[in-house]
């Protein structure tokens, strides 16, 4: 079975700067699952926000600010990341990545 | 001094349009969000629109969804509402209000500053 | 919509007294919870965040409490400069919306 780690617990960036998050994909070829990123925001309930399906396949919630978010994935290191450009206020939250298997 | 100045209120007939805005100063004015609030002559506040420091993010009330457009411009330190299809309902004093800003140890969220409002009449 | 209610609607004080203003939410908004002062023909100005948290330069004698759905402001001492209208406002979910207000006025 997959498992899943985000290396950064914590990431503290300046204002409308970018920020890149990273999610480790072992026990399973990041090729053959799909990546899923969801933010928290203090208050609120847990958003979809996109998503690298195994085929590079990127789609992204409507209705979230385009541009703002950049989904990748690199084979090499197996790792799937979430780029978040312009940071802003609005943006702090807790970012969690999931795993679908094919 | 850390200032808003709110300008471009008037008389207009409902149906009409509105462009409010409201010059900035003494803060870097691209590192705050900003709000629209209005009051409505003898009643309380409302809030109307809010928009995030870099434009990501613009949310409306109900209210005047649809016809009202929040925007800023950075460069010009400078943040508009314009507001199209005026109703009798949107006679009010209209502040424009800075959001409390982000340092790397706390956020919160809360209208630190405050402009001393334009007044919109809507009336034929 | 999160609906804020503040009671009571007008209070009448004399100076140095305790005034106790109460806001409550129609949901939970964990502590997400700004209080604000307004003169007459003034803009608002921000006395409380965070539910608790004294904006900086705000006379100590006003003090925030409460989280969830159940909010206070309080007024330890109340002076002249005090007399005005007190709102609370959540910023836990869009809308932001505001309650309703309390005057505080001269007995």
């Known amino acids: 079975a997959g498992h899943l780690e985000q290396p950064q617990i914590s990431s503290t960036k300046t204002l409308s700067k970018t920020a890149r998050l990273e999610c480790v994909v072992s026990g399973i070829t990041i090729s053959a699952t799909s990546v899923y990123w969801y933010r928290e925001r203090p208050g609120e309930v847990i958003q979809f926000l996109v998503s690298i399906s195994y085929d590079g396949t990127v789609r992204k919630e409507s209705g979230i600010p385009s541009g703002k978010f950049e989904v990748d994935r690199i084979p090499e290191t197996s790792t799937s990341t979430l780029t978040i450009h312009n940071v802003e206020k609005q943006d702090i939250a807790t970012y969690y990545c999931a795993l679908w298997e094919v | 001094e850390v200032q808003l100045v709110e300008s471009g209120g008037g008389l207009v007939k409902p149906g009409g349009s509105l462009r409010l805005s409201c010059s900035a100063s003494?803060?870097?004015?691209?590192?705050?969000?900003m709000n629209w609030v209005r009051q409505a002559p003898g009643k309380g506040l409302e809030w109307v629109s809010s928009?995030?420091?870099?434009?990501?993010?613009?949310y409306y009330a109900d209210s005047v969804k649809g016809r009202f457009t929040i925007s800023r411009d950075n460069a010009k330190n400078s943040l508009y509402l314009q507001m199209n299809s005026l109703r009798a309902e949107d006679t009010a004093v209209y502040h424009c209000?800075?959001?409390?800003?982000?340092?790397?140890?706390?956020?919160?969220?809360?209208?630190?500053?405050w402009g001393q409002g334009t007044t919109v009449t809507v009336s034929s | 919509e999160i609906v804020m209610t503040q009671s009571p609607s007008s209070v009448s004080a004399s100076v140095g007294d305790r005034v106790t203003i109460t806001c409550r939410a129609s949901?939970?908004?964990?502590?997400?919870l700004a209080w604000y002062q307004q003169d007459p023909y003034k803009a608002p100005k921000l006395l409380i965040y965070?539910?608790?948290t004294l904006q900086s330069g705000v006379p100590s004698r006003f003090g925030g409490r409460g989280s969830g759905t159940e909010f206070t402001l309080t007024i330890s001492s109340l002076q002249p400069e005090d007399f005005a209208v007190y709102y609370c406002q959540q910023y836990n979910n869009w809308p932001r919306t505001f309650g309703q207000g309390t005057k505080v006025d001269i007995k």
């Open positions: 003494g803060f870097t004015f691209s590192n705050y969000d």
């Open positions: 209000a800075r959001d409390v800003g982000v340092t790397t140890d706390y956020y919160y969220y809360g209208m630190d500053v």
């Open positions: 949901q939970g908004i964990n502590s997400w």
């Open positions: 965070a539910a608790s």
């Open positions: 928009i995030s420091s870099s434009s990501s993010y613009i």
